[in-house]
């Protein structure tokens, strides 16, 4: 379990636009402690983007990243 004083990255909301797949370098899923589920994509410019895990493009990107890992 996470230490009480270690902030966990969660999503307030999600991007409303699909990110080009070639911009994406990595991803992680937000913690079950978060109030809403989320996938955080890390772009090649080191920006983090919150995305909705129920959207098809998000699931595809996650699946592709897993396959290439």
């Amino acid at each position: 379990s996470l230490a009480a004083d270690t902030p966990t990255a969660c999503c307030f909301s999600y991007t409303s636009r699909q990110i080009p797949q070639n911009f994406i370098a990595d991803y992680f899923e937000t913690s079950s402690q978060c109030s809403k589920p989320g996938v955080i994509f890390l772009t090649k410019r080191s920006r983090q983007v919150c995305a909705d895990p129920s959207e098809e493009w998000v699931q595809k990107y996650v699946s592709d990243l897993e396959l290439s890992a």
Epitope: A9, C11, F12, Y14, C34, Q48, C50
Partner: antibody, heavy 120, light 109 residues
Amino acid sequence: QVQLKESGPGLVAPSQSLSITCTVSGFSLTGYGIHWVRQPPGKGLEWLGVIWPGGGTNYNSALMSRLSISKDNSKSQVFLKMNSLQTDDTAMYYCARGPLITTEVSMDYWGQGTSVTVSS
Amino acid sequence: QAVVTQESALTTSPGETVTLTCRSNTGAVTTSNYANWVQEKPDHLFTGLIGGTNNRAPGVPARFSGSLIGDKAALTITGAQTEDEAIYFCALWYSNHWVFGGGTKLTVL
């Protein structure tokens, strides 16, 4: 670079409605929320509400009944509308950019504000 | 609605370390309140300094740090500079809305 600019009427008569526009540049409303905050003269900040990329909103519960936030992504504009204004709504009104991730600064860039005076 | 309380004013000297705090009337401030700190300089210039309890915004000097101290959120300025004289507001997230504290006027002299 990131910029936000508020534009409003300046003077509003009591019981009338207020409309303010926040025009942004340097980022897209599809990737960030926009918060609205106000500051009465000589007082602290009061959070009014936020609109998220998909159009969802959260509001200050004390003001929810007379507050509405909307946007036009194609024009990079966000709109605040408040009804039934009274003199204690006199304040500087600000919009601020809202990243979506909780570990980032939640209101990182701010506009310069627009002054609203409620008076007859 | 929650009430968030800050020191109304603090005074420090250049080079000293000063800590501003942020208390919630609903109980202990936790990492789930995602404490933020905003600086107000003259002419209504606002800048977000700290988010998510302890994360500095890009470009914010390393002398600014956020933390939880006891049941409160805290902003510590290690080696205050004269240009740090400003009003500092904390903001706490309560499930679906933000609440600001009343602000701390920091004087550096």
